[in-house]
């Protein structure tokens, strides 16, 4: 009996035309939502003039439906048993699941000012930037609508730069009508234990953002894992959002709509400093902001973002060192709301429910040559927003799963 089930599972989780896995893999049957909470800055003037702590108040959720588009350019390679694809990006605003509209205004850090002053550290260039910042009446903070902040706006300061630069700025710009990839993953035909594991991303086995093992593309994309998952496993996956591979460990047994699943969570150790977790040494890319690699809980992904000083963390700086959150008032981290988890059906390896949570922050530093940053006395890793991307298997799919998979085993 068990052997027959194993054989059936092995057959059905292969990523090729005609299998259950393939159908759900090409276009997810699960509704996936991305909720955003924006950190609205309450005291912009005091910060700019006196280098005060930044007081933030989160506003949200603002919800978008995402991952509703089928994978594109799906191409099987029989020679190396891989399948390659592009994952198109799309986001549709869901007013009924949101606290307001895309036209809601927020006071946030001026993304262009913070980024330009970081990218161009030469004093002369900063003096040029300063004159353009002043001319465009830009400041350290700005008021932007949700739509502008997420999907892009024409920046008045960058529009004055007299040589070719991208003048449109947005945390997720460009997004709609773009695609992530090309991913090339093992289809599992020759070896089911490799199914969905990424072979290459954008044609490479490495990212070129990090040193040593940190640069590797490990595991799957977290939508599924090879079948017959054990609680003792460490599940590796790659997330292009955070420009790195990461891992999850077993936390608890969960019953999801009558289906027994394993809850795997991202442990605090994954965000630890190299002092506590030596494996993380290669995620520490500079010595000043990281206080000689002793800070933890924030990841500098500037190399992956054309030099823009983007730092990724968990929401509200969960699992981050006190020095990171010290200059920010109004944060309340808690595990239940702010950690990432994956609920995996162990027989198939399918992720039936997940909550991916992350926070986007921007570094802003004092600059003697940029007037609006002149009075800062310290560096700030400024939270801009946090997001919660969730998906849960639908009732119909759950019934089908129970009858065809778990029911047959039990």
């Amino acid at each position: 009996g068990d052997l027959l089930i194993q054989k059936t599972i092995k057959k059905q989780v292969v990523l090729e035309e005609g299998t259950i896995a393939f159908k759900n893999w090409v276009k997810t049957g699960t509704e996936v939502y991305r909720q955003f909470w924006i950190f609205d800055v309450q005291n912009p003037q005091e910060v700019m003039m006196n280098s005060s702590n930044i007081q933030v108040k989160q506003r949200g959720p603002y919800t978008y439906r995402v991952r509703f588009l089928a994978k594109e350019n799906v191409t099987q390679d029989a020679e190396d048993n891989t399948v390659s694809f592009l994952q198109p990006n799309g986001a549709i605003f869901e007013p009924s699941l949101s606290v307001g509209t895309e036209a809601d205004n927020f006071t946030v850090l001026n993304l262009a000012v913070a980024a330009a002053s970081h990218i161009y550290q030469n004093q002369f260039v900063q003096m040029i930037l300063n004159s353009l910042i002043n001319k465009s009446k830009s400041s350290m903070f700005q008021v932007r609508t949700l739509r502008e902040l997420l999907w892009g706006y024409r920046d008045p300061f960058l529009s004055l730069v007299p040589y070719p630069v991208t003048t449109t700025v947005g945390l997720f710009y460009p997004y709609n009508n773009t695609a992530d990839g090309v991913y090339k993953v093992f289809n599992g035909k020759d070896n089911i234990s490799k199914v969905a594991i990424i072979d290459t991303y954008k044609g490479k086995r490495n990212l070129s953002y990090w040193e040593s093992h940190c640069d590797m593309i490990n595991g799957t994309d977290a939508a599924s894992f090879p079948p017959f998952v054990e609680k003792s496993q460490v599940l590796q996956f790659f997330s292009s959002d955070i420009c790195r591979s990461i891992y999850a460990v077993f936390e608890s047994d969960v019953n999801l709509k009558g289906i027994p699943v394993y809850r795997f969570v991202l442990p605090s150790k994954a965000f630890a400093s190299p002092v506590e977790n030596p494996d993380n040494y290669c995620f520490c890319t500079e010595k000043i902001i990281s206080k000689n690699c002793t800070s933890y809980g924030v990841l500098d992904i500037s190399k992956c973002k054309e030099g823009r000083p983007v730092y990724i963390s968990l929401p509200h700086f969960l699992y981050a060192s006190p020095d990171v959150s010290e200059p920010i008032d109004g944060l309340n981290p808690n595990e239940e709301e702010h950690r990432t988890y994956l609920d995996i059906e162990p027989i198939t390896g399918f992720t039936l429910q997940f909550a991916k949570r992350l926070q986007v922050n921007l570094l802003v530093k004092p600059s003697e040559k940029i007037q609006v940053l002149k009075n800062l006395k310290r560096n700030y890793i400024v939270p801009i927003l946090w997001l919660n991307e969730t998906g849960t298997i639908g009732d119909e799919k759950a019934n089908m799963f129970r009858s065809q998979v778990t029911g047959k085993i039990n």
Epitope: Y120, N122, F124, M127, P162, Y163, E368
Partner: antibody, heavy 118, light 107 residues
Framework: QVQLQQSGAELVRPGASVKLSCKAL????????MHWVKQTPVHGLEWIGG????????AYNQRFKGKATLTADKSSSTAYIEVSSLTSEDSAVYYC???????????WGQGTLVTVSV | DIKMTQSPSSMYASLGERVTITCKAS??????LSWFQQKPGKSPKTLIY???RLLDGVPSRFSGSGSGQDYSLTISSLEYEDMGIYYC?????????FGAGTKLELK
């Protein structure tokens, strides 16, 4: 040792233009900005402007906007200043000067004498 | 524009004497000030940057001080090769501006 080699003296007619060069040696040309300074007995030293070859950024003294144009050729590590619609007022010694990571105007070229005369 | 007023415009001093030249800015320039020496027919030579930092290779008898609007260059013990014209420059904001110069001659 960093060196700045400027082009030779120029005798030019009023109304014409002149393009002076400053070749940079022994450092990474795109890292630091090059400034141009005009010197006359009447006005002393005057900053014309500067260019950062790495970013393409330029800054000008308003007094010289429309009069002087700064460019840089990364392939030959050479900075240029073009002075147009020349009058006797433009007769001067023109210096290029390099700013390094530590000091502004740390190195100077030998200067180019421009004489505007009929 | 920031105006740099240098004084004296010229001075005579003896060898071994302590010499001080001053430069006053029309506004606070945050110590973004350099000092240059120029000899006849030669290009300027940078001595001091950031108000008080000595450029490599410059003799230690030269020193700079000051903050805000007021700055000075001091030669602790004058030597023959120190004769020439001394200029200050502010690079706090555009346009960068030079002082009119101080001509130092042997008494």
């Amino acid at each position: 040792q960093v060196q700045l080699q400027q082009s030779g003296a120029e005798l030019v007619r009023p109304g014409a233009s002149v393009k002076l060069s400053c070749k940079a040696l022994n450092y990474t040309f795109t890292d630091y900005e090059m400034h141009w300074v005009k010197q006359t007995p009447v006005h002393g030293l005057e900053w014309i402007g500067g260019i950062h070859p790495g970013s393409g950024g330029t800054a000008y003294n308003q007094r010289f906007k429309g009069k002087a144009t700064l460019t840089a050729d990364k392939s030959s590590s050479t900075a240029y200043i073009e002075v147009s619609s020349l009058t006797s007022e433009d007769s001067a010694v023109y210096y290029c000067s390099l700013t390094t990571a530590s000091a502004w105007f740390a190195y100077w070229g030998q200067g180019t004498l421009v004489t505007v005369s009929v | 524009d920031i105006k740099m007023t240098q004084s004296p415009s010229s001075m005579y001093a003896s060898l071994g004497e302590r010499v001080t030249i001053t430069c006053k800015a029309s506004q606070d320039i945050n110590s973004y000030l350099s000092w240059f020496q120029q000899k006849p027919g030669k290009s300027p030579k940078t001595l001091i940057y950031r108000a008080n930092r000595l450029l490599d290779g410059v003799p230690s008898r030269f020193s700079g001080s000051g903050s805000g609007q007021d700055y000075s260059l001091t030669i602790s013990s004058l030597e023959y090769e120190d004769m020439g014209i001394y200029y200050c420059l502010q690079y706090d904001e555009f346009p960068l501006t030079f002082g009119a110069g101080t001509k130092l001659e042997l008494k």
